[in-house]
C-alpha cells in the first residue's frame, strides 16, 4: 500500500508549487524502509555495490559536472543548475568556459578552470581547504571539497558567490540520489539537507541512507555484518 | 581607507643595494587573498612590474630583474620591502607599491597605489 | 613575455569628443586591464576584465576587446581626462604594462 501526501513545498526556483510525496507502508504496520535500513535491515546496496545506484550515482556526476550557478536577476537567490534549468530572461547562468575562468592559481595563470562556477563556492574565496601549493583544487567540481571556511569578506565582486543560496544537496530515498533542493522540499520528502554542502558530488547519500557505521570509504558499501543483525 | 606609502633612500651610488619599504594602512596582508606588488616608473617614461608578495608568502618576480631582487613583509608591522641588489644607473625611477585586489575579477589588478618614492642612483 | 602595444602614443581631443585608443597584445590574452596617471600622480585603475568600471570611475569609460585587440574609450572627452592611459596584462608573467598613450586636451 502506499501513503499519498501532498503539500504546497517552496521550490528551486523561488515559487511553492504542489508536490507529491508517495511512502511504500509496511504491509506489517510497522516502521517504515529507510527506518528499517537504518535498523539494520539486509539491504543489499548497504552491504556491497549495487550496480544500478553506482550508475544512478555517476550519471548524477555528469550532470553535475556541467552545471553553474543560476542567479536570479531580482537577487531573490541562486542555486545550481544545468543551463537549460535556469531562465534566459530572469536569471544569469553563471559557467566558466573557455577562456572566461579565473586561473587554476596565482603561480599557474595560463590554464583556466572551465569546471564551475558554483554557487556559494569558489577556490579563490575559499580559506580551509584553501586551493594552493600542492593542494589545488582540480578543474572537475565535482572533485572539489566542502569548503569549511570562507574568506572574511561581505562581499566578493562574484555573482554566484554574493546571491543568497537557495538549495543545497538533499539526499532522498532509499536508493541513495541526491538532488540540489530547498530546505523546505527536502524535509517534505523526508531528505536529508546539506546545509555544509554545495555540491552533490561532495556528499554521500548511500552512506546516509544506511546509516550505522559508516562506510570505511564513503563510496564502497560494507556494512557485511547486516547479515547477522537481521 | 586604505593607503600605501613608499619610502627610500633618494639617492645612492651605483653597486649599492636599494632599500624600499611600503607601509600600508586599511589592509592587512595576512588576510587571505590579498597581495601587495612593487612597479617603477623611470622619468618620463612606462610602468615596469617588479615583484609581488602574497599573504601566503607566495612571491613573483620580473625574470629579467629576479636575480637583484628580494621581496619580503612583515605582516604585524603592516609593511613589504623590497631589495634591488648592485643598482645601476638605468635604476633610477619612481618606485610605486600597490595592493592587488580580485574584487569581481577572475585575474586580480592593483586598485590602489602609494604616491611613490623618487631614487636616483648617481656616482 | 607579452608585449602590449598602445596606440596612438600620443593624441588629442576637444571636450565632448569621443576617443578611442587601443591596445594590442603579442599574443592572447584573456582580459585586459587599464589605468589612468595624471601628470605628478600615481596610477589609477580604471578598468579590469577588459569591461568592469572600477570603483568610482565615470561611466564615460569604457573598455572592450578579446584576444589580442582591446581598447578604451572615453564617450565624451572631459578636462579632467587628459592623462597618460596604460594597458596591462595578468595572463602570464611577467606582468607587463603598455608603453601608454597620452591623452590631451584641445
Known amino acids: 500500500a502506499q501513503h499519498v501526501t501532498t503539500q504546497l513545498v517552496l521550490r528551486n526556483k523561488g515559487v511553492y508549487e504542489s508536490v507529491k510525496y508517495i511512502q511504500q507502508e509496511n504491509f506489517w504496520i510497522g516502521p517504515s524502509s529507510i527506518d528499517l535500513i537504518h535498523l539494520g535491515a539486509k539491504f543489499s546496496p548497504c552491504i556491497r555495490k549495487d550496480q544500478q545506484i553506482e550508475q544512478l550515482v555517476l550519471r548524477e556526476r555528469d550532470l553535475e559536472r556541467d552545471s553553474g550557478c543560476c542567479v536570479q536577476n531580482d537577487h531573490s537567490g541562486c542555486i545550481q543548475t544545468q543551463r537549460k534549468d535556469c531562465s534566459e530572461t530572469l536569471a544569469t547562468f553563471v559557467k566558466w568556459q573557455d577562456d572566461t575562468g579565473p586561473p587554476m592559481d596565482k603561480s599557474d595563470l595560463g590554464q583556466k578552470r572551465t569546471s564551475g562556477a558554483v554557487c556559494h563556492q569558489d577556490p579563490r574565496t575559499c580559506e580551509e581547504p584553501a586551493s594552493s601549493g600542492a593542494h589545488i583544487w582540480p578543474d572537475d567540481i565535482t572533485k572539489w571539497p566542502i569548503c569549511t571556511e570562507q574568506a572574511k569578506s561581505n562581499r566578493t565582486g562574484f555573482l554566484h558567490m554574493d546571491c543568497q543560496i537557495k538549495g543545497r544537496p538533499c539526499c532522498i530515498s532509499t536508493k541513495g540520489s541526491c538532488e540540489i533542493t530547498t530546505r523546505e522540499y527536502c524535509e517534505f520528502m523526508h531528505g536529508y539537507f546539506h546545509e555544509e554542502a554545495t555540491l552533490c558530488s561532495q556528499v554521500h547519500c548511500l552512506d546516509k541512507v544506511c546509516g550505522l557505521l559508516p562506510f570505511l570509504n564513503p563510496e564502497v558499501p560494507d556494512q557485511f555484518y547486516r547479515l547477522w543483525l537481521s | 581607507q586604505v593607503t600605501l606609502k613608499e619610502s627610500g633612500p633618494g639617492i645612492l651610488q651605483p653597486s649599492q643595494t636599494l632599500s624600499l619599504t611600503c607601509s600600508f594602512s586599511?589592509?592587512?596582508?595576512?588576510?587571505?587573498?590579498?597581495?601587495v606588488g612593487w612597479i617603477r616608473q623611470p622619468s618620463g617614461k612606462g610602468l615596469e612590474w617588479l615583484a609581488h608578495?602574497?599573504?601566503?608568502?607566495?612571491?613573483y618576480y620580473n625574470p629579467a630583474l629576479k636575480s637583484r631582487l628580494t621581496i619580503s613583509k612583515d605582516t604585524s608591522k603592516n609593511q613589504i620591502f623590497l631589495k634591488i641588489a648592485n643598482v645601476d644607473t638605468a635604476d633610477s625611477a619612481t618606485f610605486y607599491c600597490?595592493?592587488?585586489?580580485?574584487?569581481?575579477?577572475?585575474?586580480?589588478?592593483?586598485?590602489?597605489w602609494g604616491t611613490g618614492t623618487t631614487v636616483t642612483v648617481s656616482s | 613575455q607579452i608585449v602590449l602595444t598602445q596606440s596612438p602614443a600620443i593624441m588629442s581631443a576637444s571636450p565632448g569628443e569621443k576617443v578611442t585608443m587601443t591596445c594590442s597584445a603579442s599574443?592572447?590574452?584573456?582580459?585586459m586591464y587599464w589605468y589612468q596617471q595624471k601628470p605628478g600622480s600615481s596610477p589609477r585603475v580604471l578598468i579590469y576584465?577588459?569591461?568592469n568600471l572600477a570603483s568610482g570611475v565615470p561611466v564615460r569609460f569604457s573598455g572592450s576587446g578579446s584576444g589580442t585587440s582591446y581598447s578604451l574609450t572615453v564617450s565624451r572627452m572631459e578636462a579632467e581626462d587628459a592623462a597618460t592611459y596604460y594597458c596591462q596584462q595578468w595572463n602570464s608573467y611577467p606582468l607587463t604594462f603598455g608603453a601608454g598613450t597620452k591623452l590631451e586636451l584641445k
Open positions: 576584465d577588459t569591461s
Open positions: 586599511g589592509f592587512s596582508l595576512s588576510t587571505f587573498g590579498m597581495g
Open positions: 608578495i602574497w599573504w601566503d608568502d607566495d612571491k
Open positions: 599574443s592572447s590574452v584573456s582580459y
Open positions: 600597490a595592493r592587488i585586489e580580485n574584487y569581481g575579477s577572475n585575474y586580480w589588478y592593483f586598485d590602489v
